[in-house]
């Protein structure tokens, strides 16, 4: 396994939607055909992942239909949106690109996104 | 026992089609990059095409770009290569090839070990 | 494309004899080189992965060394069965590319 340098934003602030995009940028040094994009969500000493996606380069990403994940895809760029978040899901989101094939098999963790969610204030009842 | 079996080849007119076939069984077909390797009569070993497990990805050689369509079918274990627009230097046996991967903390291991008996596709008039 | 050059094309030996085929890439290619062996009218078998690692099975006389551009194959004790075309192939870049071949008879 080889070392690969992934760069991502430090800070982001989700919508008042619940939607957070960044990009996710590594540096290829290697001319890999499929690589694997997977975001990790670390909080509280715990890491899970919230989804993962293979693609082709200079295809697009396709994240299971069931994913809060989609994103595009540009050389060596990930852009990546999360959606459907709420303010407990405020944490550490990191960047993990493989370069899958053909080989070297590369690597590459970022440092991660910290993305902020503040849950929208309910609006007043009405009387109109 | 792992196996992998083609069908599909023939004798085909320039200019026509064929679809190969590669049955494979004993292995957890999903998890394999597979491959299309040819052999012109007499000849060296030709690399063709490659498909990822997911098929999500695929990669061809020059020669049979936009002619040949690799894909598979993983709940029917088959690989498929669609062959249009077929010249006489297509003329080979064509074998599918799958691509092992070992995966350890430290490597990743490639190589084509696990190989079809070939199908003979002949293009002449 | 990377060319793999492969040499020689053919070649005649006794029994006992020790066998030595070369292989050069066109660039560098690490070590992610494969030696292939393949008998009259059948498939291919991988012998050698990652330019000098033995495959499971295969008799301990075939070795492999190399990287970079410059790759050996040996075997060191020529057998009857041993009779075959031998590949290489690089295994990096695409297009996946193979040696053209070397031919091993018996004398």
């Known amino acids: 396994c080889k070392a690969m340098h992934v760069a991502q934003p430090a800070v982001v602030l989700a919508s008042s939607r619940g939607i957070a995009s960044f990009v996710c940028e590594y540096a290829s040094p290697g001319k890999a055909t499929e690589v694997r994009v997977t975001v990790l969500r670390q909080a509280d000493s715990q890491v899970t992942e919230v989804c993962a996606a293979t693609y082709m380069m200079g295809n697009e990403l396709t994240f299971l239909d069931d994913s809060i994940c989609t994103g595009t895809s540009s050389g060596n760029q990930v852009n990546l949106t999360i959606q459907g978040l709420r303010a407990m899901d405020t944490g550490l989101y990191i960047c993990k690109v493989e370069l899958m094939y053909p080989p070297p098999y590369y690597l590459g963790i970022g440092n991660g996104t910290q993305i902020y969610v503040i849950d929208p204030e309910p609006c007043p009842d009405s009387d109109f | 026992e792992v196996q992998l079996v083609e069908s599909g080849g023939g004798l085909v007119q320039p200019g026509g089609s064929l679809r190969l076939s590669c049955a494979a069984s004993g292995f957890t077909f999903s998890s394999y990059y597979m491959h299309w390797v040819r052999q012109a009569p007499g000849k060296g070993l030709e690399w063709v095409s490659y498909i990822s497990g997911s098929g999500s990805s695929t990669y061809y050689a020059d020669s049979v770009k936009g002619r040949f369509t690799i894909s598979r079918d993983n709940s029917k274990n088959t690989l498929y290569l669609q062959m249009n627009s077929l010249r006489a230097e297509d003329t080979a046996v064509y074998y599918c090839a799958r691509d092992r991967m070992l995966v350890d903390s430290v490597n990743r291991v490639f190589g084509f070990d696990v190989w079809g008996q070939g199908t003979l596709v002949t293009v002449s008039s | 494309d990377i060319q793999m050059t492969q040499s020689p094309s053919s070649l005649s030996a006794s029994v006992g004899d020790r066998v030595t085929i070369t292989c050069q890439a066109s660039q560098d290619i690490s070590n992610y080189l494969n030696w292939y062996q393949q008998k009259p009218g059948k498939a291919p078998k991988l012998l050698i992965y990652d330019a000098s690692n033995l495959e499971t099975g295969v008799p301990s006389r075939f070795s492999g060394s190399g990287s970079g551009t410059d790759f050996t194959f040996t075997i060191s004790s020529l057998q009857p069965e041993d009779i075959a075309t031998y590949y290489c192939?690089?295994?990096?870049?695409?297009?996946?590319?193979f040696g053209q071949g070397t031919k091993v008879e018996i004398k």
């Open positions: 192939q690089q295994h990096t870049n695409f297009p996946f590319t």
